[in-house]
Amino acid sequence: LQEKIEEIAAKYKHLVVKKCCYDGVRINHDETCEQRAARISVGPRCVKAFTECCVVASQLRANNSHKDLQLGR
């Protein structure tokens, strides 16, 4: 997960945009990525970075938990 997110974040050379990506990675079981992104007011660049990283992180976590289930963990 960390490697993949670092790969995505490396594209963003504006520090705030990069940090928007990292914010998207934070675990939040109560809201979807879209719901969380809707509260962002600093600009579309932040929304895009947040959403991309949030979705990727959610997918990777889902895949990992699915693998854990298959392995009977």
């Epitope: 050379k13 504006h14 705030v16 945009v17 007011s41 600093v42």
Partner: antibody, heavy 118, light 111 residues
């Protein structure tokens, strides 16, 4: 209407520090990044750094080698730029500006003249 | 850092003529179809004023005689026709990445 109002002119001795303020009004202060630029007499614009007041995130121009510190007071909607170890080459007009959509500077302060002289 | 090189450093134009200023970036300032190049006008004793953002979008209240174009590393600001009040310094600026950088400026004088 959006306004950025800066503090008044300063005259400083070499080696001292200066702290310039930039009071924002007419918009939600925490929604936009505040940048600081400077312009030496007869010269172009030099970017110094910025702060995102909502999170306190900052980034600085490495040319200033740790001499610059940018802070923000959300309670008063004011951003500050402090420059230390002043030298004569720091004599310039210092500007704050609001960055809209992480793309462009749509509003600027009126500028603060800082003169460094012994 | 992205270095922005403006040319010419100065130019004198007669009223009614066209003024063209170019800005060349040391690397592309485009990202996923968006251009992060902006232009500002600065008159003596005043702060810079936004003219054009994202290469070609006029800020509100800016006269239509100002226009911007370009992509990648090469950008142009055009004033056509030039008016006496356009005497000023003009700066390009990129916001794609930190550090934000400005061109060295172009001084436009009206003959």
């Amino acid at each position: 209407q959006v306004q950025l109002v800066q503090s008044g002119a300063e005259v400083k001795k070499p080696g001292s520090s200066v702290k310039v303020s930039c009071k924002a009004s007419g918009y939600t202060f925490t929604d936009h990044i505040i940048h600081w630029m400077r312009q030496a007499p007869g010269q172009g614009l030099e970017w110094m750094g910025y702060i995102y007041p909502r999170e306190g995130w900052t980034n600085y121009n490495e040319n200033f080698k740790g001499r610059v510190t940018i802070t923000a007071d959300k309670s008063t909607s004011t951003a500050y730029m402090e420059l230390s170890s002043l030298r004569s080459e720091d004599t310039a007009v210092y500007y704050c500006a609001r960055e809209r959509n992480l793309e462009y500077f749509d509003y600027w302060g009126q500028g603060t003249t800082v003169t460094v002289s012994s | 850092d992205i270095v922005l090189t403006q040319s010419p450093a100065s130019l004198a134009v007669s009223p009614g003529q066209r003024a063209t200023i170019t800005c060349k970036a040391s690397q592309s300032v485009d990202y996923e179809g968006d251009n992060y190049m902006n232009w500002y006008q600065q008159k003596p004793g005043q702060p810079p004023k936004l003219l054009i953002y994202a290469t070609s979008n006029l800020d509100s209240g800016v006269p239509a005689r100002f226009s911007g174009s370009g992509s990648g590393t090469d950008f142009t600001l055009t004033i056509n026709p030039v008016e006496a009040e356009d005497t000023a310094n003009y700066y390009c600026q990129q916001s794609l990445e930190d550090p934000h950088t400005f061109g060295g400026g172009t001084k436009v004088e009206i003959k």
